[in-house]
Interface confidence: low
């Protein structure tokens, strides 16, 4: 029997009346046209609701925006507009939410034609006041906030300039210009991309990499000939053109770009691409493109410099620059990751790592499934994940997979169960064990949430009919009861719940259709009432996570450590909380040969454990270029992984001896950098 | 059963133009890259062109640049070579090939220019 | 662009020798070689791809290795129908995709 019918399937009493309870309703006083929502800061309650409408004239397009505000988690709204007098909102640049708990917003104004410059309307008080104020420039991309301090703002112009307020968007001042790309790194620190020669397409290779440290005020520029650059981790990544051709480089660096060293990376071409998919402050995953336009590329794993990669899988489905691809870092246990690859018949199959890309596997096949057709075999084939890719090709997959670091272990994605990714309509499919094993949830396309830190689940079927029932499970995906929360249906456009999965309530967003006019309409139901007590500690159980052989007296060791933790029962209806912290007890495990990556110079045959030494370096004295010096490796292979916590066990030695030689790292040599000041 | 046929090769002057023909058949030709390759009387082989899957990157040795144009009509699962201002040492056996990626898995038989006055 | 350095130029061996043809190439290209036989009058054919994984329908005899800059072709019993010249290519970067200038093996 399909999921959640099964006889066991416990019941939730009176669900009903607690839910008719606690579902509240909002019409908006809006024509149909666009609707954006954002929440302002964690455990508030607060949201904010932008809805645009363009009316088309014959000359030009009217358009009008209103700004609503609610801070008991959308049940109610109040209409808000008259705060930003008024005012037509771009959508493009959306509402800047401030970082952390804040409580800033900016929204951009559309402004008339003739203007000196752009406007904005800034809150610092969680959107109870706006000040409006007239910009010095017109901007181009959304106001950036420093991760570290919510008064420091950075925004490109339309002439690409680089603009800095230090104090929330009040005072701007232009510290830069012909500015092609600009970040925030740690410390307010502010990296941006310079052209010389007309525009950034022009001089794109010929970039030059700046960066200041106080805000404008001093200059030094790291690196020539860039590309691109990028952020992750603790890492900083260029991608410089060669001397010689066309062909361009990753270099790296750890000190905010004093110090450079070439990533031990294929160059890449024209058309192709590199592209960061994951970074931590241990490690990056790279995807670097194949040749051509193949569709698919490779994934390195780097070490903890960043500098010495691991080829971890290869045929990695990616197809663009800008592109898809299917990777998703699996927030509910340490060390999944999920991507897809295209194999040689140009099928797409999805592989699943469990320790942080040393090995990649498909998916088992769930128990409760058959085969589809695209399975040779009947009897064996693999859960297949529908992710941005499926998505972008207008599969019917309304969402991409869904997990949260605190609903430990659970997974929820679309899929189809075969050989491959199959065309066909997709079912629901959840894994409670971070992807180890999966079950068939729900049948067909749907939308899907997390509530209450994996104590509840809920579902919207993906359907073009009007809608008025919304699903829920209490136990993980196994059993579900279906609640009508509106007499007349409405046109379903999306599931919007707090950011974290520790709220109870749910928004469910639409609109209404009658012959005269169409409706925003949201309703948000709050669970409280389903999940009548809190959890006690009889509610948890101890699960032991990456375990897949209970006789192994290393089970569940990945990257060094095993993790213990404390997970709510199945069986158990009750809150987790707004506070609930995950409980895990870790512990060390020895070292093997699966806790090293192989050096630089050293490679790993297919399934083996050993590094075996490059045959072009045999007999040949291991010398790298690493912050402009000439270093000297003594290794037999191994180097630990990122973010490997074994001890005792296999202990491979591994020395660099500094050569003190001057080496130049390409073309970010310390000696070709200079400092400004303004 | 892979098939590439090459037609269109024959004697032509010094400065003249001739197009090549490649008739895939056999594979999905639209998934699949195809490049051009070709071998001098007593030589060795020399990559001429390569285009990509649907048409949208196209590749040459900067020696042939400018003057060969490699295009593909996936609706007729055939691949051109369009060489211009043709040299004497443009004489050779040109072979069309399939090129999935790592390498050129399939090739037709050959067809022959003489670039001769 | 990258140079494929291919030896020996030319080589004559019995049948059921083994015979080793290696290909040095200027740069790492990462295992993205492929090996080609062709015979007289007759179009290429596709031995090895990916430095060592065989085509499909080639005999066992033929393999490939190597990785970094140096690969070899070997065949390790030679049978009369393996008399031809063999090529190998890199498909590493954006194009040229060199050939190597050919190994012609001849019977002694």
């Known amino acids: 029997s399909a999921p959640g019918e099964d006889e066991e399937c416990g019941r939730v009493r009176d669900f009903v009346a607690k839910l008719a309870n606690n579902t509240h309703q909002h019409v908006f006083d809006d024509l149909r046209g666009s609707v954006s929502l954002s929440w302002v800061g964690d455990s508030t309650g607060v949201i904010l609701v932008l809805t645009t409408f363009h009316v088309p004239l014959v000359i030009m397009t009217f358009g009008q925006s209103k700004l609503y505000r609610s801070e008991d988690y959308g049940k109610n709204f109040k209409d808000i507009t008259d705060l930003i007098n008024n005012t037509f909102i771009r959508t493009e640049f959306g509402m800047a939410i401030g970082p952390e708990n804040s409580g800033k917003v900016v929204l951009t104004a559309e402004v008339s034609g003739g203007s000196r410059g752009g406007r904005i309307f800034r809150s610092s008080d969680f959107a109870k006041n706006f000040v409006q104020t007239d910009l010095p420039f017109h901007p181009l991309t959304q106001m950036m906030y420093s991760p570290q301090n919510s008064d420091y703002l950075l925004a490109l112009s339309t002439e690409n300039g680089l603009w800095v307020s230090k104090n929330f968007g009040g005072k701007w001042e232009e510290i830069h210009k012909a500015v092609c790309l600009a970040k925030w790194g740690s410390d307010n620190t502010i990296f941006f991309t310079t052209y010389a020669n007309g525009s950034c397409k022009a001089d794109l290779g010929a970039l030059e990499l700046w960066r200041t440290s106080d805000l404008g005020k001093s200059f030094k520029t790291i690196g020539v000939k860039i590309y691109s650059f990028g952020l992750g981790g603790r890492f900083l990544f260029a991608s410089v053109m060669a001397d010689k051709d066309t062909t361009r480089r990753i270099h790296v660096s750890t000190d905010q770009g004093d110090t450079w060293s070439m990533a031990q990376l294929p160059s890449v071409g024209q058309e192709q691409f590199y592209s960061i998919l994951a970074a931590n402050d241990d490690m990056v995953f790279m995807h670097v493109d194949e040749p051509g336009d193949t569709g698919f590329g490779t994934i390195f794993t780097s070490d903890d410099r960043g500098i010495v990669y691991s080829k971890s899988l290869d045929r990695h489905l990616y197809t663009t620059t800008g592109g898809e691809t299917d990777f998703t870092n699996v927030t509910s246990l340490r060390g999944v990751y999920i991507t897809s690859v295209l194999s040689e018949d140009n099928s797409i199959q999805t592989m699943i790592t469990f320790d942080q890309g040393g090995r990649w596997t498909h998916l088992r096949k769930p128990e409760n499934s058959e085969c589809d057709a695209t399975a040779k075999n009947k009897n064996e084939c693999s859960l297949h994940i529908h992710a941005s890719y499926s998505i972008s090709q207008k599969l019917n997959v309304p969402m991409a997979p869904l997990s949260e670091p605190n609903a430990v272990g659970i997974v929820i994605a679309h899929g189809s169960v075969g050989d491959a990714i199959s065309v066909m309509v997709p079912d629901v499919y959840i894994s409670d064990d971070g992807g180890y094993s999966w079950t068939k949830m729900l049948e067909g396309p749907h939308y899907y949430t997390i509530l209450d830190s994996g104590g509840i689940i809920v579902a919207i079927e993906h359907s073009s009919r009007p809608i008025n029932v919304i699903k829920f499970s209490t136990d993980e995906g196994q059993c579900w009861q279906t609640y009508t929360f509106t007499r007349d249906p409405i046109y379903f456009t999306g599931l919007a719940s707090e950011p974290g999965a520790r709220s109870m309530n749910i928004s469910i967003w639409g609109f209404t259709e009658s012959f005269l006019t169409s409706q925003w309409v949201s309703y948000t139901i709050d669970f409280k009432d389903i999940l009548e007590r809190n959890c006690e500690e009889k509610d948890y159980t101890i699960w032991l996570a990456h375990s897949t052989d209970p006789e192994d007296y290393e089970d569940g060791c990945i990257l060094g450590y095993k993790e213990q933790f404390l997970r709510l029962r199945k069986s158990s209806v009750c809150q987790n909380g707004r506070d609930y912290v995950v409980t895990k007890q870790p512990s060390i495990c020895l070292c093997s040969l699966e806790d090293f990556l192989c050096d630089f110079g050293y490679y790993r045959p297919e399934n083996d454990s050993k590094c075996v030494e490059q045959p072009e370096l045999k007999g040949h004295d291991l010398e790298f270029c690493l912050y402009g010096r000439e270093e000297h490796l003594t290794t037999n292979g191994y180097r630990k992984i990122p973010g490997d916590k074994c001890q005792g066990g296999v202990n491979p030695v591994r020395e660099v001896k500094d050569l003190k030689k001057k080496c130049t790292s390409n073309f970010l040599s310390p000696e070709k950098q200079n400092s400004k000041s303004n | 059963e892979v098939q590439l046929v090459e037609s269109g090769g024959g004697l032509v002057q010094p400065g003249g133009s001739l197009r090549l023909s490649c008739a895939a058949s056999?594979?999905?030709?639209?998934?699949?890259?195809m490049s051009w390759v070709r071998q001098a009387p007593g030589k060795g082989l020399e990559w001429v062109a390569t285009?990509?899957?649907?048409?949208?990157?196209?590749y040459y040795p900067d020696i042939l640049k400018g003057r060969f144009t490699i295009s593909r009509d996936n609706a007729k699962n055939s691949l051109y070579l369009q060489m211009n201002s043709l040299r004497a040492e443009d004489t050779a056996v040109y072979y069309c090939?399939?090129?999935?990626?790592?390498?050129?898995?399939?090739w037709g038989q050959g067809t022959l220019v003489t670039v001769s006055s | 662009d990258i140079q494929m350095t291919q030896s020996p130029s030319s080589l004559s061996a019995s049948v059921g020798d083994r015979v080793t043809i290696t290909c040095r190439v200027s740069?790492?290209?990462?295992?993205?070689l492929a090996w080609y036989q062709q015979k007289p009058g007759k179009s290429p054919k596709l031995l090895v791809y990916?430095?060592?994984n065989g085509a499909d329908g080639v005999p066992s005899r033929f393999s490939g290795s190597g990785s970094g800059t140096d690969y070899t072709l070997t065949i390790s019993s030679l049978q009369p129908e393996d008399f031809a010249t063999y090529y190998c290519?890199?498909?590493?970067?954006?194009?040229?995709?060199?050939f190597g200038q050919g190994t012609k093996l001849e019977i002694k």
């Open positions: 740069e790492n290209i990462y295992s993205n």
């Open positions: 290519q890199h498909f590493w970067g954006t194009p040229p995709w060199t």
């Open positions: 090939a399939r090129h999935p990626g790592g390498a050129m898995d399939y």
């Open positions: 990916a430095a060592t």
């Open positions: 285009i990509s899957s649907g048409g949208i990157y196209t």
């Open positions: 056999g594979f999905t030709f639209n998934i699949y890259g």
